[in-house]
Amino acid sequence: KIDACKRGDVTVKPSHVILLGSTVNITCSLKPRQGCFHYSRRNKLILYKFDRRINFHHGHSLNSQVTGLPLGTTLFVCKLACINSDEIQICGAEIFVGVAPEQPQNLSCIQKGEQGTVACTWERGRDTHLYTEYTLQLSGPKNLTWQKQCKDIYCDYLDFGINLTPESPESNFTAKVTAVNSLGSSSSLPSTFTFLDIVRPLPPWDIRIKFQKASVSRCTLYWRDEGLVLLNRLRYRPSNSRLWNMVNVTKAKGRHDLLDLKPFTEYEFQISSKLHLYKGSWSDWSESLRAQTPEEEPTGMLDVWYMKRHIDYSRQQISLFWKNLSVSEARGKILHYQVTLQELTGGKAMTQNITGHTSWTTVIPRTGNWAVAVSAANSKGSSLPTRINIMNLCEAGLLAPRQVSANSEGMDNILVTWQPPRKDPSAVQEYVVEWRELHPGGDTQVPLNWLRSRPYNVSALISENIKSYICYEIRVYALSGDQGGCSSILGNSKHKAPLSGPHINAITEEKGSILISWNSIPVQEQMGCLLHYRIYWKERDSNSQPQLCEIPYRVSQNSHPINSLQPRVTYVLWMTALTAAGESSHGNEREFCLQGKAN
């Protein structure tokens, strides 16, 4: 704390608040009888700038010229030093350095709406660090003037509170802003404008949309605007899109027909307004209107596939599968699928509506020629039916694709490749690649996936519904007219050694050999496609290496004979399973002693 100048005075010229770059004169003078005891020439006056000595003088007063002070506050303290005593504070001074206002730039004025008030903004320029008074002046026709002041360090906006009217839209108005602080003043360049230049219309309101006869092709957008609006621009987009469609309209009078909307799509609409073709500015965009366009009947055709399963000598099961139409093809909410099954020679037909599923299973006689047609229906109509003749898809051996392989291709993808069939490859009209999770029971409830490939392709990347560590049964069909040939293979996108080995559930003796039966490894423990089983055996209590028999994996197989065991010797047996990544741990161990004679 600095004492309140009891021993002397500090005077400052020209002021305690100075312009950046200017000089300040600081004088420190002792009051009478306030110097050092005995001799005044022993008085040593010292001037400090913060804690640093910058000047001293022997006598009753000290005069110092200071330059180069930074923006903001600098503290000076005058002290008296006498021989054999501590320095005594005399008085202090704070000098504040600021900046004269720069010329305000980019003065622009706006009136929001025909009933709004004129408000102006500008760029202040460099911070003055000082209280700066801004005066905004507006002069108009008939020597009318308005003035508004704002007394704030950071002022860059003022509202006159007056409303310009359209009586004489071409009349000129001039605005100017002047900044004044204790270090100087500066005025902007004048900004001259007319009513039409500065009135920015209010955004349109009360936006509505109407579809005549519930049709997307007869759509009108309605809105309300201020009275003088001449131009509008409309923008609209599907709610899930980032790109806007833009339309400019003149003298729209609050309505416009839109011709290119897609059916059954939620759109966002916004409108902006302007008073004059080339003067003034566009209003803000209106609040968004969100509306869904009406449905139209579906376009496109369903992608249909099927599976045949033999039941007995007279009956077969047909399972039909189809893919959903894309949103742009469905053009509405699909209410049901219509499936028609027809025997082509007898003409008998049955039709069924399916809701909530994209598959249908039925049982038909094995005799006769059968065809199906499947279409999708929404509230406005149905898609064109997809017709398929039911045939034996794998009957034509010469049409079977050759050298089918399935290889992992990155995460959760399988690349299926093949060679064209031996029979004239040009006869192939298309390939269908089908895949489903491999289930030992051949479960028909397992979802079926397929994709179609052009006749010149010899590979397909399958990625839909592919999971890691699951084995898929993959078939490639070559279709030609009413014939088909197929080849199959197992494949997985990612594999590792199975988590467990098969569980031996029985060992039986048959004519000097044994039959081992086992339970399949649970699908979730197989960890990919099984390639082999191994059966191990060795004499009980023996340290010798076990013998083994390797069996290629077949889906339906769960027993195998072994005929190399010695009679009346107790053996320990166990099994493992192998994928391309390695061998599982042991399954359970079983002991067995063959009773019969050795072979």
Epitope: I2, Y131, K151, I153
Partner: nanobody, 119 residues
Framework: QVQLQESGGGLVQAGGSLVLSCAAS????????MSWYRQAPGKQRELVAE???????TYADSVEGRFTISRDNAKNIVDLQMNSLKPEDTAAYYC?????????????WGRGTQVTVSS
């Protein structure tokens, strides 16, 4: 912001004395500088004298030796002792307070008090 109230103005004979007083109220903390300005009819407003919170002073050349500015920091009062008054000292006298506002100065002004020196 600070509110300033001036008092002490009036009519005085040339050569006479007056004391103007200015009291600061409101958020009067951290008042860096208290000043007296004057504005004669048809002229620019000019600095008369100022006093910092540490007691240092500045005087206009025209009043040096005749006027004395003093400040009571505790009460936020600034006085201007005016001696040997001249007719050219006739003006409206305004009190001003500069307060710290972040790293800037914010100014507040009083409404003014009239001093008239007759010859």
């Amino acid at each position: 912001q600070v509110q300033l109230q001036e008092s002490g103005g009036g009519l005085v004979q040339a050569g006479g004395s007056l004391v103007l007083s200015c009291a600061a109220s409101g958020s009067a903390a951290l008042i860096f500088l208290m000043s007296w300005y004057r504005q004669a009819p048809g002229k620019q407003r000019e600095l008369v004298a100022e006093v910092s919170r540490y007691g240092s002073t500045t005087y206009a050349d025209s009043v040096e030796g005749r006027f004395t500015i003093s400040r009571d920091n505790a009460k936020n009062i600034v006085d201007l002792q005016m001696n040997s008054l001249k007719p050219e000292d006739t003006a409206a006298y305004y009190c001003k307070a500069d307060q710290y506002y972040g790293d800037s100065l914010r100014s507040s002004w009083g409404r003014g008090t009239q001093v008239t020196v007759s010859s």
